[in-house]
């Protein structure tokens, strides 16, 4: 899968929550960021994530679509210069400081179940999705498309009105 342009086609600032309405939050601890899945108190501000959407071409041997064989890839950045990365060896999702061009581990294929409900498939390990495991984000293997509706890999995107990505 090759990214067709170096610039995102659009960017979208949103808060990220699980299908069960727990918030994905990010905390700086000992000079590195930790990712948490937690219930927020009423009126507590949600962390926001900058989603950058890129167009990606299917590998030509996988698709007969030609110019139409496009997918949406996203990168997720909760704070400047940091992006979510798939660590396929550890089956973990981590925040790393990176410079552009970003490594493939920072790209995820976007799947929509419907508007504002999405799943993120690892670019570097097809069939493996960002999911929730023991109140943390992890990489979860999904065996078939029937399991794409499984709640632990579904996330909701919601607009953030309060403050800007710094």
């Amino acid at each position: 899968m090759s990214i067709t342009g170096i610039s995102p086609i659009t960017e979208y600032l949103a808060s990220l929550s699980t299908y069960n309405d727990q918030s994905i939050t990010f905390a700086l601890e000992d000079e590195s960021y930790e990712i948490y899945v937690e219930d927020l108190k009423k009126d507590e501000k949600k962390d926001k994530v900058l989603l950058s959407y890129y167009e990606s071409q299917h590998p030509s041997n996988e698709s007969g679509d030609g110019v139409d064989g496009k997918m949406l890839m996203v990168t997720l950045s909760p704070t400047k210069d940091f992006w979510l990365h798939a660590n396929n060896k550890e089956h973990s999702v981590e925040l790393h400081k990176s410079e552009k061009p970003l490594p493939d581990q920072a790209f995820f294929v976007l799947h929509n179940m419907h508007s504002n409900s999405v799943s993120f498939e690892s670019k570097t390990d097809p069939g493996v999705f960002i999911g929730v495991k023991d109140n943390h984000l992890a990489l979860i293997k999904v065996d078939s498309s029937e399991n794409l509706s499984t709640e632990n890999i579904l996330f909701k995107l919601s607009e953030t009105h309060h403050h800007h990505h710094h």
Epitope: T10, E55, H58, G64, L110, N112, M113, S149
Partner: antibody, heavy 121, light 106 residues
Framework: EVQLVETGGGLVQPGRSLKLSCVAS????????MYWIRQAPGMGLEWVSS????????YYLDSVKGRFTISRNNAENTVYLQMNSLRSEDTATYYC??????????????WGQGTLVTVSS | DIQMTQSPSVLSASVGDRVTLSCKAS??????LDWCQQKVGEAPKLLIY???NLQTGIPSRFSGSGSGTDYTLTISSLQPEDVATYFC????????FGGGTKLELK
């Protein structure tokens, strides 16, 4: 080349049923969301129904919920719209459209030529 | 539900004119907006997706812009073949079309 060919339209009496088909070619059908959109004579476009790439998620315009059913057969590259209890206000050209991106409900990149459904006694 | 309002409903312009069509959403749609063109007796055709991205094969005189609730389609130099009805369409929450703008030649 992407092609979408709708069939099944025609004249039908109120309260009766009709099943529309859309045969797709030129792309990997099972990767894409598919849609039905309609246009009443001389009017604008109205989204009717959507189905995700594996057929597990379906969505409907409120006024057709419980009467229309969208389905797909990925082995035959075909999407269907079963229309029951038809009303005069369902009279329209029905277009089939494909999603712009694999696995994504965002945008419609290609449309068929449409099939006319006329509901009249 | 998100409502989409297009203005004007009819627009007359001359060949070579710069033409601007407007689309307003009832809520923020986060640039999740397309424009399509429909000529008389034909199926609609996608022109612009995600607010400002030109669909393959569409002439570069077409461009899109906007954010939040307000979006614009611009034709930099109107050509006779651009006579058509133009629809905006949002997919941020559900799927909704605007009522259309019919573009005519003066």
């Amino acid at each position: 080349e992407v092609q979408l060919v709708e069939t099944g339209g025609g004249l039908v009496q109120p309260g009766r049923s009709l099943k529309l088909s859309c045969v797709a070619s030129g792309f990997t059908f099972s990767n894409y969301w598919m849609y039905w959109i309609r246009q009443a004579p001389g009017m604008g476009l109205e989204w009717v129904s959507s189905i995700n790439n594996d057929g597990g998620n379906t969505y409907y315009l409120d006024s057709v919920k419980g009467r229309f059913t969208i389905s797909r057969n990925n082995a035959e590259n075909t999407v269907y719209l079963q229309m029951n209890s038809l009303r005069s206000e369902d009279t329209a050209t029905y277009y089939c459209a494909k999603g712009h991106y694999s696995y994504s409900s965002y945008s419609f990149s290609y449309w068929g030529q449409g099939t006319l459904v006329t509901v009249s006694s | 539900d998100i409502q989409m309002t297009q203005s004007p409903s009819v627009l007359s312009a001359s060949v070579g004119d710069r033409v601007t069509l407007s689309c307003k959403a009832s809520h923020n749609i986060n640039k999740h907006l397309d424009w399509c063109q429909q000529k008389v007796g034909e199926a609609p055709k996608l022109l612009i997706y995600f607010t400002n991205n030109l669909q393959t094969g569409i002439p570069s005189r077409f461009s899109g812009s906007g954010s939040g609730t307000d979006y614009t389609l611009t034709i930099s130099s109107l050509q006779p073949e651009d006579v058509a009805t133009y629809f905006c369409f949002q997919y941020n929450s559900g799927w909704t079309f605007g009522g259309g703008t019919k573009l005519e030649l003066k």
